[in-house]
């Protein structure tokens, strides 16, 4: 399962985390900083 950086047009998509591209799934994914969740790491749950 390979991952790469998201394309530049995804800049700012992940609000509190790192945008990665899951190659096998053809999907952008936000790897959230701890304390954040949600598809775009938009929700602070602490």
């Amino acid at each position: 399962v390979s991952i790469t950086k998201c394309s530049s047009d995804m800049n700012g998509y992940c609000l509190h985390g790192q945008c990665i591209y899951l190659v096998d799934m053809s999907q952008n994914y936000c790897r959230c900083e701890v304390g954040y969740t949600g598809v775009r790491c938009e929700h602070f749950f602490l």
């Epitope: 790192q18 994914y29 790897r31 900083e33 929700h43 749950f45």
Partner: antibody, heavy 118, light 108 residues
């Protein structure tokens, strides 16, 4: 296929510590955070905490601070949870679970049964 | 912490019957962060419904979920034998994350 393989059942004496493991396979381990959950007859499911497999940071349920310590070894795609100063109250099944896209716990390990008895 | 109260604790239903169980939160939970898990004896919990109303992969269409704020529910339109299990609601809105005590669904 995504799998979380946990270490085997443990029978330990009160007062000691135990470290249980959760090995991820079938996916890129450092993409998804891992949670630990306790299941006992008395209290159903209890969230212990979550650890970022990439950053290494952890957040604990206040109730388990000082009791549980979560760590990650990225090189072996394995998460660990150490439980300290064990008492009979710690006897339970402990699960690791992967946090999916968005936040549901989409894959769970098979569970590690911990029995604390003298 | 957010307390999730599930009712009923135990229920039984006949084949083909419509089943509804509820999950009431002690304070408001965003519908995006309310999930349901199914657990059968001797097995791990399985993600069943996520973000209130989305069925997890492989979950039959007879299941549905709804709700908002403090009141959520899981419904089975036509009970089947394989649906016998314990269902837990779970919130990821505020730390500590919490689970309900479960609704055990039995076949009558």
């Amino acid at each position: 296929q995504v799998q979380l393989q946990q270490s085997g059942a443990e029978l330990v004496r009160p007062g000691v510590s135990v470290k249980i493991s959760c090995k991820g396979s079938g996916y890129t381990f450092t993409v998804y955070s891992l949670h630990w959950v306790k299941q006992s007859h008395a209290r159903s499911l209890e969230w212990i905490g979550v650890i970022s497999t990439y950053y290494g940071d952890a957040i604990y349920n206040q109730k388990f601070k000082g009791k549980a310590t979560m760590t990650v070894d990225k090189s072996s795609s394995t998460a660990y949870m150490e439980l300290a100063r064990l008492t009979s109250e710690d006897s339970a099944i402990y699960y690791c679970a992967r946090e999916g896209n968005g936040n549901p716990l989409d894959y769970w390990g098979q569970g590690t049964t911990l029995t604390v008895s003298s | 912490q957010i307390v999730l109260t599930q009712s009923p604790a135990i229920m039984s239903a006949s084949l083909g019957e419509r089943v509804t169980m509820t999950c009431t939160a002690s304070s408001s939970v965003s519908s995006s962060y309310l999930h349901w898990y199914q657990q059968k004896p001797g097995s791990s919990p399985k993600l069943w419904i996520y973000s209130t109303s989305n069925l997890a992969s492989g979950v039959p269409a007879r299941f549905s979920g709804s709700g908002s704020g403090t009141s959520y529910s899981l419904t089975i339109t036509n009970m089947e034998a394989e649906d016998s299990a314990t269902y837990y609601c779970h919130q990821y809105h505020r730390s500590p994350l919490t689970f309900g005590a479960g609704t055990k669904l039995e076949l009558k």
